[in-house]
């Protein structure tokens, strides 16, 4: 069997059924073109942070390489909520009602919802269980990530945004320790002075007393 590896979240929560129906939004595009500009061994972006060279963990997107093109496979997605999310018209309906809005084939469901089994309909994600952070054509919401034991929750999972996790106080994760949180250094080496405290993303920063040239421990 053929196929390529793709990294994504390993959630600890099992999904519940989606509640409510949502009006789908137009503007869906057709098939994916066979050339894209994403290159490199990894596209790392921690959930809840801006895109950039952040440390990856198992629940981070990486590049999935195809012969003809490369593109990002979604695990824990970049938390981009399109501005259209603010203007979504949600139908005030109770769980289990069988009403839905119809729309032409190929239209996308808004953030916070997913494709229903009923053509042209969207189901709302369940708060704290699943999310979609962009307009989508998915048959299910993406599962909320559970923070690891060495992490704390910076912000909870909502229907439009995945859980944001960060290292617990006194620990950090950077490019050199992508998989786990490491203990912050207790102090600077002899002849250096601390200029920056430890954060969840970096160790303490020290500079030489004489030169003022700084570096991370």
């Amino acid at each position: 069997a053929s196929g390529t590896e793709a990294a994504a979240a390993t959630p600890s929560k099992v999904w519940g059924s989606s509640a409510g129906r949502i009006e789908p939004r137009g503007g869906g595009r057709g098939a994916l073109p066979t050339s894209m500009g994403q290159h490199g061994p990894s596209a790392r972006a921690r959930a809840g942070r801006a895109p950039g060279p952040r440390p990856a963990r198992e629940a981070s997107p990486r590049l999935r390489v195809h012969k003809t093109f490369k593109f990002v496979v979604v695990g824990v997605l970049l938390q981009v909520v399109p501005s259209s999310a603010a203007t979504i018209k949600l139908h005030d309906q109770s769980i289990g009602t069988q009403q839905w809005e119809h729309s032409p084939l190929g239209e996308l469901c808004p953030p916070g919802s997913h494709r229903s089994e009923h053509p042209g309909a969207c189901n709302r994600c369940t708060e704290g269980v699943g999310y979609t952070n962009a307009s989508n054509n998915l048959f299910a919401c993406l599962p909320c990530t559970a923070c690891k034991s060495d992490e704390e929750e910076r912000s909870p999972c909502t229907t439009t945004r995945n859980t944001a996790c960060q290292c617990k106080p006194g620990t950090f994760r950077n490019d050199n320790s992508a998989e786990m949180c490491r203990k912050c250094s207790r102090g600077c080496p002899r002849g250096m002075v601390k200029v920056k405290d430890c954060t969840p993303w970096s160790d303490i920063e020290c500079v030489h007393k004489e030169s003022g040239n700084g570096h991370n421990i």
Epitope: S2, A31, F71, V73, L77, G106, P119, N136, L138
Partner: antibody, heavy 128, light 108 residues
């Protein structure tokens, strides 16, 4: 490498039950929708059921609805198909297949639908 | 349920010839949701095309897909010995997902 392996097939009498397993390796199992597809002797492919991502929404073909149940154990990287009230017409080779996955592109989440990884199949024979 | 009809049922061609396989849907299917598979006896099916026209990983460029609405086509530009098989179209446009009955491509 990326692969799916089915097991649990066999000969069973009409009305009885059977549970098929699909063991995955080489990829992050919980991130993909996994399908069951079958092929009866001398017939074409028939879609049976799917379970999306971490064990969320599941859908069934009308011919098996109410009799078959799809489930998954992400800790074991395994998908199951519980088949109850089996009929002669359920006789087939059963394949599990992975859906391609979800991509974030141009601010849209897209499922690029197509079963890109298949197991070799397990044979179920329903006969008295 | 979307019913897919494939034609012809069997296509007898020689090596190097062009094969054109048709898939017709009973109702409109978005081009994002139409896939093609190749299936050989004793083997697992193989994804060729998804989203109507995007080739799957490792699929040679002699395979191409096109179409929209209710009419879709798989084209094999020059038949190679390994291309003789049964080809299925499949739709993801609406549930239940369905396959066509298949087109068998055999050697003339």
């Amino acid at each position: 490498q990326v692969q799916l392996v089915e097991s649990g097939g066999g000969v069973v009498q009409p009305g009885r039950s059977l549970r098929l397993s699909c063991s995955a390796s080489g990829f992050t199992f919980s991130s993909y929708g996994i399908h069951w597809v079958r092929q009866a002797p001398g017939k074409g492919l028939e879609w049976v059921a799917v379970m999306w991502y971490a064990g969320s929404n599941e859908y069934y073909a009308d011919s098996v609805k109410g009799r078959f149940t799809i489930s998954r154990d992400n800790s074991k990287n395994t998908l199951y198909l519980q088949m109850n009230s089996l009929r002669a017409e359920d006789t087939a080779v059963y394949y599990c297949a992975r859906d391609q996955g979800v991509l974030l592109r141009f601010g849209e989440l897209r499922g690029y639908y197509g079963m890109d990884v298949w197991g070799q199949g397990t044979t179920v024979t329903v006969s008295s | 349920e979307v019913v897919l009809t494939q034609s012809p049922g069997t296509l007898s061609l020689s090596l190097g010839e062009r094969a054109t396989l048709s898939c017709r849907a009973s109702q409109s299917v978005s081009s994002s949701y139409l896939a093609w598979y190749q299936h050989k006896p004793g083997q697992a099916p193989r994804l060729l095309i998804y989203g109507t026209s995007s080739r799957a990983t490792g699929i040679p460029d002699r395979f191409s897909g096109s179409g929209s609405g209710t009419n879709f086509t798989l084209t094999i530009s020059r038949l190679e010995p390994e291309d003789f098989a049964v080809y299925y179209c499949q739709q993801y446009g609406s549930l239940p997902f369905t396959f066509g009955p298949g087109t068998k491509v055999d050697i003339k």
